[in-house]
Amino acid sequence: VSLRIQEGCSHLPSCCPSKEQEPPEEWLKWSSASVSPPEPLSHTHHAESCRASKDGPLNSRAISPWSYELDRDLNRVPQDLYHARCLCPHCVSLQTGSHMDPLGNSVPLYHNQTVFYRRPCHGEEGTHRRYCLERRLYRVSLACVCVRPRVMA
Amino acid sequence: VSLRIQEGCSHLPSCCPSKEQEPPEEWLKWSSASVSPPEPLSHTHHAESCRASKDGPLNSRAISPWSYELDRDLNRVPQDLYHARCLCPHCVSLQTGSHMDPLGNSVPLYHNQTVFYRRPCHGEEGTHRRYCLERRLYRVSLACVCVRPRVMA
């Protein structure tokens, strides 16, 4: 199975044959991009609470801690994306690791990621055996960051 | 120009024809993913210094400020990637925005991003008119995060 850049198809970026009525295993292999978030998923309780741990993954040690939420779509490449969800409105104190400091805000860092969606190819013969890969920008929150509140001029 | 999932090529995920000796304009249109980093690039001086601003983009307001370094490869999708480079070893004080607090470390958050590389297709007829798209995981630093130092058990 391969992706072929090919002329003669109006769809950007792709039209692709597929086996009718069969889950396309090769597509799954190809499209299953990194299925882990930037930091290993932590299933311990502290990953879901507003405190900065002294161990564990970076997202739980941060003073703007966050958890990862899975966004899965099998018709997309990558199939699995992870969104960071801030666990505190303010930053956690470096001293205590638990009390919030109103001087700092914990805010998500957003990014428009390039993804590809599998779509039916319209206006082609044999549409049952074709799909198109459509490139899109998809907004994901990468992490939560401790920032000084914006001062309006 | 389109991407076609096609059998009969040993390269995962793709083999693709290209116009010989011509810059592939359609490839450029297709592959030019979001060429901006998560936050707008700031050309002001404070974006490159170890201080937390009270205005400007998120990466300069963070108490773990960072700058973006462009990583451009025209044979890759996306062509442009941005790496976060931490501007301070420690977190900046929320009070002053300039003095560093040794209680916190400013560390990069890494992520293995899915990218596609344009490669010659080996073992195929008409190789001059073909290239392959090869899926790879590519490590990028997304941002810098203020964390409590890890305490070893």
């Epitope: 597929s18 099998l74 599998r118 049952h128 799909y131 | -």
Partner: antibody, heavy 123, light 108 residues
């Protein structure tokens, strides 16, 4: 052929836990997702949660803290556990197969449903 | 979280008539599905990813729409179509399946 069958306790006392098992046949749990849906008497359908073929789970955000979905692929069984039941949890609980492929795309419809199991919360 | 609003809540039609019911989403929806539930039975998939008809569904049923506005049409209603019809959407993030409140179709 594809079949799903729910089995539950029928009656649960308030504040107690509910455990329902969905036993499937005609397909493999590693290839499909399973959704849990409930329907209070005379009311509409409410999605509770889902488990993917690889075991990843998603829950209704309102009920997340009370729900747990797990499965045993070898036994072809999916389990729903719900804590701290109240009278408004009285409903018919359904399991439904999710994710079918038509040769082009994956669809997130619930294409096969169990007959449901009735749960009454009462003292 | 996307909210699906179905209208009308109840409707009646005579055999042979054409009926249309709508499903309005609070924000744009990518995947929309329709189910039929007869009294005392489990829901049955009718339409997947509008406008595709599920296996075994009579061609008198059709689905249309995009974005925030969808509809289900029965070209010539039959007595056996008396049921409640639900629209349902799926979103990958936040990962949810959402049902509309339902439209009850009565046959005169």
């Amino acid at each position: 052929q594809v079949q799903l069958k729910e089995s539950g306790p029928g009656l649960v006392a308030p504040s107690q836990s509910l455990s329902i098992t969905c036993t499937v046949s005609g397909f493999s749990l590693t290839d499909y997702g399973i959704n849990w849906v409930r329907q209070p008497p005379g009311k509409g359908l409410e999605w509770l949660g889902m488990i993917w073929g690889d075991g990843v789970t998603h829950y209704n955000s309102v009920l997340k803290s009370r729900l747990s979905i797990s499965k045993d692929n070898s036994m072809s069984q999916i389990f729903l556990k719900m804590n701290s039941l109240q009278t408004d949890d009285t409903a018919r609980y359904y399991c439904a197969r999710t994710l079918f492929y038509d040769g082009t795309l994956y669809y997130y419809a619930m294409d096969y449903w169990g007959q449901g199991t009735s749960v009454t919360v009462s003292s | 979280q996307i909210v699906l609003t179905q209208s009308p809540a109840t409707m009646s039609a005579s055999p042979g008539e054409k009926v249309t019911m709508t499903c309005s989403a609070s924000s744009s929806v990518t995947y929309m599905y329709w189910y039929q539930q007869k009294t005392g039975s489990s829901p049955r998939l009718l339409i997947y990813d509008t406008p595709n008809l599920a296996s075994g569904v009579p061609v008198r049923f059709s689905g249309s729409g995009s974005g925030t506005s969808y509809s289900l049409t029965i070209s010539r209603v039959e007595a056996e179509d008396a049921a409640t019809y639900y629209c349902q959407q799926w979103s990958s993030y936040p990962h949810t399946w959402t049902f509309g409140g339902g439209t009850k179709l009565e046959i005169k």
